[in-house]
Interface confidence: medium
């Protein structure tokens, strides 16, 4: 029951997380003009991964897409890629995890298969969450270091000489949505991996019944169960994974190469 709850909760948390990652990726407010210390203007600028917008004090809002691909900063492209990879992995993970849910019966799918699928989706959620967190963090770092859109090139009246001034941009709502969503997806993935450990069918060890007849002992091995080697056998429970049985102590940890945070 606890395993089903853990799996179900992991799925729901991951679902919310991935929805958040999608929302963050689509949002326009990745960076917003800092209103705290700016000269007076009726214009408020903010930018997303796909377009930049202007909102005026009258309420009028106008957005313009980044119609160029080659002209965009490499870091912005990298953030886009990380977010899209996160969404794709998360979506596949959700699809896999639906079939892995213990509360859903699909034909005669064995628990071992569900365990595998739960583990796969869990890993996908973890990587998806890491991608989102990495993407948002890279963008936040760009803002902090004024790496992207940090200067406004204005022309003065002095024969077209270029004048550069720092534009004050601060963290937009999308960054916080992305961080939270990435964290939720990561937590959901961990919960799925934990649920996987309890999903695998346990190797039930039955003690053989000895019948004393004709002066010699015969160990009766009931069909369909693994035979015991005797009364003094190792009764430690084992989980069966695809690719061989391992004890709990032998379960491999999966090192993540997405070591951004």
């Amino acid at each position: 029951m606890a395993v089903t709850a853990c799996q179900g909760l992991g799925f729901v948390v991951s679902l919310i997380g991935i929805a958040g990652i999608i929302a963050a990726t689509c949002m326009d407010q990745w960076s917003t003009q800092d209103l705290y210390n700016n000269p007076v203007t009726a214009v408020f600028n903010y930018q997303g991964l796909w377009r930049s917008c202007v909102r005026e004090s009258s309420g009028f809002t106008e957005c313009r897409g980044y119609f160029t691909l080659l002209g965009l900063p490499a870091m912005l492209q990298a953030v886009r890629a990380l977010m899209i990879v996160g969404i794709v992995l998360g979506a596949i993970g959700l699809l896999v995890s639906i079939f892995a849910l213990k509360c859903i019966r699909i034909g005669s799918m064995e628990d071992s298969a569900k365990a595998n699928m739960t583990l796969t989706s869990g890993i996908m959620f973890i990587v998806s969450g890491l991608c989102a967190i990495a993407g948002v963090s890279v963008f936040a770092n760009m803002l902090v270091t004024n790496f992207w859109m940090s200067t406004a090139n204005m022309y003065t009246g002095m024969g077209g000489m270029v004048q550069t001034v720092q534009t004050r941009y601060t963290f937009g709502a999308a960054l916080f949505v992305g961080w939270v969503a990435g964290g939720l997806t990561l937590i959901g993935g961990v919960m799925m991996c934990i649920a996987c450990r309890g999903l695998a069918p346990e190797e039930t060890n039955y003690k053989a019944v000895s019948y004393h007849a004709s002066g010699h002992s015969v160990a009766y091995k009931p069909g369909g169960f693994k035979a015991s080697t005797g009364f003094g056998s190792n009764t430690k429970n084992k989980k069966i994974y695809d690719g061989g049985a391992r004890t709990e102590d032998e379960v491999q940890s999966y090192p993540s190469k997405h070591d951004y945070v």
Epitope: N37, N38, P39, V40, A42, E56, S58, F60, Y155, T156
Partner: antibody, heavy 119, light 107 residues
Framework: QVQLVQSGGGLVQPGGSLRLSCAAS????????MNWVRQAPGKGLEWVAY????????YYADSVKGRITISRDNAKNSLYLQMNSLRAEDTAVYYC????????????WGQGTLVTVSS | DIQMTQSPSSVSASVGDRVTITCRAS??????LAWYQQKPGKAPKLLIY???SLQSGVPSRFSGSGSGTDFTLTISSLQPEDFATYYC?????????FGGGTKVEIK
Amino acid sequence: QVQLVQSGGGLVQPGGSLRLSCAASGFTFSSYEMNWVRQAPGKGLEWVAYITGSGRTMYYADSVKGRITISRDNAKNSLYLQMNSLRAEDTAVYYCARYWNYAGGMDVWGQGTLVTVSS
Amino acid sequence: DIQMTQSPSSVSASVGDRVTITCRASQGISSWLAWYQQKPGKAPKLLIYAASSLQSGVPSRFSGSGSGTDFTLTISSLQPEDFATYYCQQANSFPLTFGGGTKVEIK
């Protein structure tokens, strides 16, 4: 060459109307907020009106509110000041100026056009 | 509305002199103050923005300082072409307002 060229000034009777124009060149006009500033003979500078790049938001000085309208045509790279119900005190040299909203200053100015309100 | 008060209204100085013009705002305007130079019959020219940043192409003898309500424009060594009228302008809130101007004349 970044510049603002003004036209439309002249002599007008009290209560009359006049439309000033300001043609921009050398920069992306629609990206900039613009202002009209005036200077009465022998007096200091007085801000008159402000308009955003889209032309959707405007601000006016109390002294001209209801009588003056600022507008722009981004397709023509032009800024306008429609002046109605003109008074003697509106006599001044009118300047159009580009507002540099990251610095809070007006970095490009037109050459000015004289509006004289007299009977 | 924010009132801008400039002083003195006029100053007589010689070439090479150090000239200081002050501008006081009726309420705090952070550092959003611009300084302009205007010569007779000409349009104003932006000298200083954000209280202390020198506009491109403006000689380094011009400098600005101050924050909040009190601001200063300093011409370290007055040149013949610097004789003009100087205006301050606040950019903290609408309506934008200018100081009354300071005329720098030849002594």
